[in-house]
């Protein structure tokens, strides 16, 4: 048993038929010695009396909020949560496996630049009795500080018959140098509590591997005289690391017809302009990627040809 | 990245072209190592990230763009002193820091070159003949070092008498290639920045 936060405890249980469970001793936080009784939130009966209560925690019926009382007055609470381990594997019932980039990916993270700021998100189909808390550090043996905000519900989607909820959190490395070469990964730890079930999820990454620039901005077309060609120009996104001559981007320019079946013309360039042929009803899209370290491409920025 | 990209102008800062070739070569070599050594821990997640230049050179600090010198977190250890007279330097414009930066890059290349050559010698003794270092990568390191053209004591190539542990050598190769790729990215960024200045 270990303390998750004040008055909230996690009991780690090996989950198999007729498992013996874990013996837990609860102590009432009071100077009182006599006349103390104990109750469990989901049952109205008195479980025991005295300053301590010994319980055998085997299943979810044994978890919950234990309260000690004296003469109708509440003295203190202890909330017991269960963390299930089956066949040596901790349960992952709360979050959805996003399966990208690989199976058992519950947390996904992205950074718009090298400032040490990143966002992580996760998915669940649960909407009630659910809480998250997030911690992060650089490295694990001698951790350096990363500060994370509160996890918030960032999107709700209908997937087939089901609602899916996306939660996200923003974190910032306390002392990040954008030019630094990372040798220790960022560790992100999410504590998830659904009802009386505790689970934890972790992700480990280098900022350089989760970079995804914002799309290029100010995408403009300038027709060239007596020609079907146009000059496309754009700018680095505002959120990208500076100076741009050090943190350089490379770009992909695509001309796409109205129909998805039409052949796409693509040009790659390190410049912030390109000359392309603009077909009728086509659109021109540009996306960006770190020039020297091939992490993710940005989303497309698009303008119609007409 | 196997994509059509325009070639650099000949009037560019001479080392930029070499540093781009270096990054391409080390990235290709790393990809080849990952594929060939697929049953070895050779991915970024699996290996220990070691920097053989740690405490010996300080390329990141010495080559920090001016704009980042205001960032406290970037100014951990800026005390470095290296001999200067590189041909990449457009002499009048060169600041003392730029000279330190380029000589630090040169020292990095020299250290990696020695490590890679030592490692290659061991890999050539492997009866499995599973993987060798790409001669192109070694040549590109050499070309960039020549372009930097610094005077520096030659580091003797390490030779070991004991029988090499080929498993360990291959793991070490992966560690070395990952670290060198990261350093090659920094070198490319620096050359791009200096070129723009």
């Amino acid at each position: 048993i270990w303390e998750l936060k004040k008055d909230v405890y996690v009991v780690e249980l090996d989950w198999y038929p007729d498992a013996p469970g874990e013996m837990v001793v609860l102590t009432c936080d009071t100077p009182e010695e006599d006349g103390i009784t104990w109750t469990l939130d989901q049952s109205s009966e008195v479980l025991g009396s005295g300053k301590t209560l010994t319980i055998q925690v085997k299943e979810f019926g044994d978890a919950g909020q234990y309260t000690c009382h004296k003469g109708g007055e509440v003295l203190s609470h202890s909330l017991l949560l269960l963390h299930k381990k089956e066949d040596g594997i901790w349960s992952t019932d709360i979050l959805k496996d996003q399966k990208e980039p690989k199976n058992k990916t519950f947390l996904r993270c992205e950074a718009k630049n090298y400032s040490g700021r990143f966002t992580c998100w996760w998915l669940t189909t649960i909407s009630t009795d659910l809480t998250f808390s997030v911690k992060s550090s650089r490295g694990s043996s001698d951790p350096q500080g990363v500060t994370c905000g509160a996890a918030t519900l960032s999107a709700e989607r209908v997937r087939g018959d089901n609602k899916e909820y996306e939660y996200s959190v923003e974190c910032q490395e306390d002392s990040a140098c954008p030019a630094a070469e990372e040798s220790l990964p960022i560790e992100v730890m999410v504590d998830a509590v659904h009802k009386l079930k505790y689970e934890n999820y972790t992700s480990s990454f280098f900022i350089r591997d989760i970079i995804k620039p914002d799309p290029p901005k100010n995408l403009q077309l300038k027709p060239l005289k007596n020609s079907r060609q146009v000059e496309v120009s754009w700018e680095y996104p505002d959120t990208w690391s500076t100076p741009h001559s050090y943190f350089s981007l490379t770009f992909c320019v695509q001309v796409q017809g109205k129909s998805k079946r039409e052949k796409k013309d693509r040009v790659f360039t390190d410049k912030t302009s390109a000359t392309v042929i603009c077909r009728k009803n086509a659109s021109i899209s540009v996306r960006a990627q770190d020039r020297y370290y091939s992490s993710s491409w940005s989303e497309w920025a698009s303008v119609p040809c007409s | 990245r196997n994509l059509p990209v325009a070639t650099p102008d000949p009037g560019m800062f001479p080392c930029l072209h070499h540093s781009q070739n270096l990054l391409r070569a080390v990235s290709n070599m790393l990809q080849k190592a990952r594929q060939t050594l697929e049953f070895y821990p050779c991915t970024s997640e699996e290996i220990d990230h070691e920097d053989i230049t740690k405490d010996k050179t300080s390329t990141v600090e010495a080559c920090l763009p001016l704009e980042l010198t205001k960032n406290e977190s970037c100014l951990n250890s800026r005390e470095t002193s290296f001999i200067t007279n590189g041909s990449c330097l457009a002499s009048r414009k060169t600041s003392f820091m730029m000279a330190l930066c380029l000589s630090s890059i040169y020292e990095d290349l020299k250290m990696y070159q020695v490590e890679f050559k030592t490692m290659n010698a061991k890999l050539l003794m492997d009866p499995k003949r599973q993987i060798f270092l790409d001669q192109n990568m070694l040549a590109v390191i050499d070309e960039l070092m020549q372009a930097l053209n610094f005077n520096s004591e030659t580091v003797p190539q390490k030779s070991s008498l004991e029988e090499p542990d080929f498993y360990k050598t291959k793991i070490k190769l992966c560690i070395l290639l990952h670290a060198f790729r990261i350093r090659a990215v920094t070198i490319d960024r620096v050359m791009s920045y200096l070129n723009a200045s």
Partner: antibody, heavy 121, light 107 residues
Framework: QIQLVQSGPELKKPGETVKISCKAS????????MNWVKQAPGKGLKWMGW????????TYADDFKGRFAFSLETSASTAYLQINNFKNEDTATYFC??????????????WGQGTLVTVSS | SIVMTQTPKFLLVSAGDRVTITCKAS??????VAWYQQKPGQSPKLLIY???NRYTGVPDRFTGSGYGTDFTFTISTVQAEDLAVYFC?????????FGGGTKLEIK
């Protein structure tokens, strides 16, 4: 002991509004969520949604968004269900049901006796 | 929404029999399943929560088991007062859905 007592049966014309009350006693009202469940004659149970008795925030199941409203009178430990623009298909027994615990909102440990609301044509 | 398919719809048994009702969820609901008993003209009563935990005061002849998508409710020795409709309910994901019910009749 813990009790949920609901208001009596109602006979409503289509288009009218009905408001059902559910008075709780025997526990701290604001510690436990209050759910509403519909049971059409001879049919199964359908969860309508719940109201957080501490914050007053209601949550509705998709089928009960729009014409249905949950509310509270905390000082009287009472929860309400209001149905606007009553329709034929709203004829049913409506139950209020208290959550099992502070941590388990949508398992129903205590139920009101039910309020039958019938449409009169 | 998650569909809870409860079988059988009807059960005609004699006192002393063992009865098993099953509930199949259309997707995994972990162990977030409850079982209720509704006697004629009454409101439902909670018997089992978290798939296998008996609620306070519920006789131990009532048991529940299961995880993921398949759940079972058992009355080890049926008694005359067990005449009722039994419902399963998933309380994993909103909307919290009930099975169609199993009507238990005593011969």
């Amino acid at each position: 002991q813990i009790q949920l007592v609901q208001s009596g049966p109602e006979l409503k014309k289509p288009g009218e509004t009905v408001k059902i009350s559910c008075k709780a006693s025997g526990y701290t009202f604001t510690n436990y969520g209050m759910n509403w469940v519909k049971q059409a004659p001879g049919k199964g149970l359908k969860w309508m949604g719940w109201i957080n008795t501490y914050t007053g925030e209601p949550t509705y199941a998709d089928d009960f968004k729009g014409r249905f409203a949950f509310s509270l009178e905390t000082s009287a430990s009472t929860a309400y269900l209001q149905i606007n623009n009553f329709k034929n298909e709203d004829t049913a027994t409506y139950f209020c049901a208290r959550s099992l615990s502070t941590m388990i909102t949508t398992t129903f440990a205590y139920w009101g006796q039910g309020t039958l609301v019938t449409v009169s044509s | 929404s998650i569909v809870m398919t409860q079988t059988p719809k009807f059960l005609l048994v004699s006192a002393g029999d063992r009865v098993t009702i099953t509930c199949k969820a259309s997707q995994s609901v972990s162990n977030d399943v409850a079982w209720y008993q509704q006697k004629p003209g009454q409101s439902p009563k909670l018997l089992i929560y978290y798939a296998s935990n008996r609620y306070t005061g519920v006789p131990d002849r009532f048991t529940g088991s299961g995880y993921g998508t398949d759940f079972t409710f058992t009355i080890s020795t049926v008694q005359a007062e067990d005449l009722a409709v039994y419902f399963c309910q998933q309380d994993y994901s909103s909307p919290y859905t009930f099975g169609g019910g199993t009507k238990l009749e005593i011969k």
